[in-house]
């Protein structure tokens, strides 16, 4: 007789989740010499231990502490790029500007990027059928708590000028309910961070509006200023051109005024 299984509103665990995490860990530690000491089997065991046999609506940051400890990594604190609702461009950028890092350029972020996972209370099974949705089911689910934990730690580590890429095509360019707006903004350390520099990425080809004057950007400025951190904003009018010029700065079209 098949056991009754809780039906959640969100998609289930990504297929081949354990193999994917392990393979990503091995690949990352091969590419990044400073993380060669990491034992990927121990990393997987710690990852698994955070959510297996636990109710998927009752996960805490403490559950992830063994994984956080194993994945401790030092990135240059003044080279951090945060992003909100524009992940692909942020990742394209750090692939070109190799000295800057998004959360997904760190081991823990790389392991979990685009993956979903959850377990079941009192069984060692991974639930491949469904996992809790943040809105419809519960916020303290394995995926949400993981990203909240690593995002908080990433923001806490930042110093000097911190950059954030924001999507200028969205109705809320800055969204207080995003991970950036609800977690990272509030965990930047004013004693270490001098400035938050927002890059507003334009979507329209001929869009020359100053999106730094958007009301939601003003709201972000207000939140940041109240935390005694300086705020500044840049329009990236043509992200394709910007990326091209970061990649090939000596290109003649990147050294002449338009």
């Amino acid at each position: 007789v098949p056991r009754w299984r809780q039906q959640w509103s969100g998609p289930g665990t990504t297929k081949r989740f354990p193999e994917t995490v392990l393979a990503r860990c091995v690949k990352y530690t091969e590419i990044h010499p400073e993380m060669r000491h990491v034992d990927c089997q121990s990393v997987w065991d710690a990852f698994k231990g955070a959510f297996i046999s636990k109710h998927p609506c009752n996960i805490t940051e403490e559950d992830y502490q063994p994984l956080m400890k194993l994945g401790t990594q030092t990135v240059p604190c003044n080279k951090i790029l945060l992003w909100s609702r524009i992940k692909d461009l942020a990742h394209q950028f750090t692939q070109v500007q190799r000295d800057m890092f998004t959360l997904e350029d760190t081991l823990l972020g790389y392991l979990a990027d685009d993956l979903t996972w959850c377990g079941e209370f009192n069984t060692s099974k991974i639930n491949y059928q469904s996992c809790p949705d943040w809105r419809k089911d519960c916020s303290n689910n394995p995926v949400s708590v993981f990203w909240k934990t690593v995002s908080r730690r990433f923001a806490e580590a930042a110093c000097d000028v911190v950059h954030v890429m924001l999507n200028g095509s969205r109705s809320k360019i800055f969204d207080k309910n995003s991970t950036f707006g609800s977690v990272e903004v509030h965990n930047l350390q004013p004693e270490k961070v001098q400035t938050l520099e927002a890059w507003v990425i334009h979507g329209g080809r001929e869009d020359s509006r100053d999106l730094c004057q958007d009301p939601t950007i003003k709201e972000l400025e207000s939140i940041i200023s109240k935390r005694n951190i300086q705020f500044s904003c840049k329009n990236i009018y043509r992200p394709d051109k910007f990326l091209q010029c970061v990649k090939n700065p000596e290109d003649s079209s990147c050294t002449s005024e338009i």
């Epitope: 400035t195 520099e197 992200p239």
Partner: antibody, heavy 120, light 110 residues
Framework: SVEESGGRLVTPGTPLTLTCTVS????????MGWVRQAPGKGLKYIGI?????NIYYANWAKGRFTISKTSTTVDLRITSPTTEDTATYFC??????????????????WGQGTLVTVSS | AYDMTQTPASVEAAVGGTVTIKCQAS??????LNWYQQKPGQPPKLLIY???TLAFGVPSRFKGSGSGTEYTLTISGVESADAATYYC????????????FGGGTEVVVK
């Protein structure tokens, strides 16, 4: 053109307002920056008034200076001068330009500067 | 901040010689680097912007180059009129003003 005025000898603690008067420049279209230079020293940015009315200060200048503007002037108030504020104060137009998919700026028009001496 | 480090602090050049001044930013400024010339008793004058674009009326013996965090001003065929102090400045973000100018390089022409 850009012209600074108001520089003079003041005693420490006496507030002083410097005025940058522009002609042929629309302050609703251009930002104006204040830069100072102590005798024999380099250039140091104090702050900037953007065309939209936003004001940015260097961290070291916060609380020590106040920038404001009218239709043809941008004022710099030194709130409580100390001897370290002895310098030539320059006002400069900031011109934004586009390149590489984004924009940047340059200080393309400077006044002659006005000398402030703080001494007891 | 975008700390701008300029080297050397002072350099001597013979008439007709070449002078090279370097400017390093603590973070990438994406080619938005300006160079200014200042003579004693005068305000600074814009020489080069966007790393390599000559400002109006500036002689072609002045050349700017570089990208990312590393920039160079080269004066070829130095003339006595080039004796001055030269400053670099980041033009990437005017909302970040601390140390946006380099410390300056004095060029002495012999």
């Amino acid at each position: 053109s850009v012209e600074e005025s108001g520089g003079r000898l003041v005693t420490p603690g006496t507030p002083l307002t410097l005025t940058c008067t522009v002609s042929g420049i629309d302050l609703n279209s251009y930002a104006m920056g204040w830069v100072r230079q102590a005798p024999g020293k380099g250039l140091k940015y104090i702050g900037i008034m953007t065309s939209g009315g936003n004001i940015y200060y260097a961290n070291w200048a916060k609380g020590r200076f106040t920038i404001s503007k009218t239709s043809t002037t941008v004022d710099l108030r030194i709130t409580s001068p100390t001897t370290e504020d002895t310098a030539t104060y320059f006002c400069a137009r900031e011109r934004e330009f586009y390149g590489g998919g984004t924009s940047g700026s340059r200080l393309d028009l400077w006044g002659q500067g006005t000398l402030v001496t703080v001494s007891s | 901040a975008y700390d701008m480090t300029q080297t050397p602090a002072s350099v001597e050049a013979a008439v007709g010689g070449t002078v090279t001044i370097k400017c390093q930013a603590s973070q990438s400024i994406y080619n938005f680097l300006n160079w200014y010339q200042q003579k004693p008793g005068q305000p600074p004058k814009l020489l080069i912007y966007y790393a390599s674009t000559l400002a109006f009326g500036v002689p072609s013996r002045f050349k700017g180059s570089g990208s990312g965090t590393e920039y160079t001003l080269t004066i070829s065929g130095v003339e006595s009129a080039d004796a001055a102090t030269y400053y670099c400045q980041q033009g990437w973000n005017s909302g970040i003003l601390d140390n946006s100018f380099g410390g300056g390089t004095e060029v002495v022409v012999k």
